[in-house]
């Protein structure tokens, strides 16, 4: 399965309109700064097959899809941004998708794509976590905006070394 | 197969140190949380702590943190529980749990140890 | 910390007979509802999770619904295995908490 260019776009896309969704500045957040143990070792193309690494990126953007369809997101978030956000991630879910069923096959996912699913999983449900003990204030989700960035371009780069590999 | 095996039975007297183990095998260790359940004998059940054997970040219940800690070795793929201080009222049964985390980041226990019988006196 | 409520506490049936367990949270826990079976001397089991969906293995004679505050473990066609003890369990909020405990014995 070859991910289309317009995917690549699509996650610069949605880069670009999560550092517009910044209000407030990073500086006046810096005590509330987390390591959420952001799975590296998922995101480095060279270790896995492409079936693997299309369920990492599947999984990140359905999880980062689901982060910002909360109705607390809802509330942190300028909504016209917040909707064109969810919208190229959506995008992005539609074209992973077709690659998933035809890399991956129908069949029950793999032990080391369970794995590494499961890896990104827990990072979104530390992010999570932190949201619910910062009881979702301001300086809270732009720490979690500015950690999603940051993944979102471990996606974009994992998405580079694939489309090499092919 | 998934297999949760615990040590066997402790018989340990008031103010001593004690580690219960939980070794697992049958899955990647490092992908799911694991955690300690207690359950006082004829009683409920009660969650006590979790831990993901990736890193081993924790997230204790506040009624047990102080009191016992838990830990990992990668090395030999197993969990522990520990104290430094018994007192009576630990005695119960202790439980090690694998969690299953669902894409909606839902947990859940999807498989058991056999439990630890640990019992306190004097 | 989010209270679970089992009711009955207990109950008396027979061979055969369908029984029907409720869950009541003290706050919203959306679908983070559980149920585990656990036999005398033995470790609980999984049976439901999320509310309603069947652990691979279990009998198609559970079954659960629900979801926010309340929830439900049916059971059809009791068979002997199922004289035990059944908790309810939510993780939607730390700490995880279980029911009290509902004790299905023969009548």
């Known amino acids: 399965c070859d991910l289309p260019q317009t995917h690549s776009l699509g996650n610069r896309r949605a880069l670009i309109l999560l550092g517009q969704m910044g209000r407030i500045s990073p500086f006046s957040c810096l005590k509330d700064r987390h390591d959420f143990r952001i799975p590296q070792e998922e995101f480095d193309g060279n270790q896995f097959q492409k079936a693997q690494a299309i369920s990492v990126l599947h999984e990140m953007i359905q999880q980062t899809f689901n982060l910002f369809s909360t109705e607390d997101s809802s509330a942190a978030w300028e909504q016209s941004l917040l909707e064109k956000f969810s919208t190229e991630l959506y995008q992005q879910l539609n074209d992973l998708e077709a690659c998933v069923i035809q890399e991956v096959g129908v069949e029950e996912t793999p032990l080391m794509n369970e794995d590494s699913i499961l890896a990104v999983r827990k990072y979104f449900q530390r992010i999570t976590l932190y949201l619910i003990e910062r009881k979702y204030s301001p300086c809270a989700w732009e720490v979690v905006r500015a950690e999603i960035m940051r993944s979102l371009s471990f996606s974009t780069n994992l998405q580079k070394r694939l489309r090499r590999k092919d | 197969e998934v297999q949760l095996v615990q040590a066997g039975a402790e018989v340990k007297a008031p103010g001593e140190s004690l580690r219960i183990s939980c070794k697992v095998s049958?899955?990647?260790?490092?992908?799911?949380?694991i955690s300690w359940v207690r359950q006082i004998p004829g009683k409920g059940l009660e969650w006590m702590v979790k831990?993901?054997?990736?890193?081993?970040?924790?997230i204790y219940n506040p009624s047990f943190q102080g009191h016992v800690s838990i830990s990992v070795d990668k090395s030999i793929t197993t969990v522990y529980l520990q104290w430094s201080s018994l007192q009576a009222s630990d005695t119960a049964i202790y439980y090690c749990?694998?969690?299953?985390?669902?894409?909606?980041?839902?947990?859940?226990?999807?498989?058991w140890g056999q439990g630890t019988l640990v019992a306190v006196s004097s | 910390d989010i209270q679970m409520t089992q009711s009955p506490s207990s109950l008396s049936a027979s061979v055969g007979d369908s029984v029907t367990i409720t869950c009541r949270a003290s706050?919203?826990?959306?679908?983070?509802f559980h149920w585990y079976r656990q036999k005398p001397g033995k470790a609980p089991e999984l049976l439901i999770y999320?509310?309603?969906n069947l652990q691979t293995g279990v009998p198609s004679r559970f079954t659960g619904s629900g979801s926010g505050t309340e929830c439900t473990l049916t059971i059809t066609s009791l068979q002997p295995d199922d004289f035990a003890t059944y908790y309810c369990?939510?993780?939607?909020?730390?700490?995880?908490?279980f029911g009290q405990g509902t004790k299905l014995d023969v009548r």
């Open positions: 749990v694998r969690h299953y985390l669902t894409q909606s980041l839902v947990d859940y226990f999807d498989h």
């Open positions: 049958g899955y990647t260790f490092t992908s799911y949380w």
């Open positions: 831990i993901d054997p990736r890193d081993s970040y924790t």
């Open positions: 706050q919203s826990v959306s679908n983070y």
């Open positions: 999320s509310a309603s």
């Open positions: 369990q939510q993780t939607h909020g730390y700490p995880f908490t």
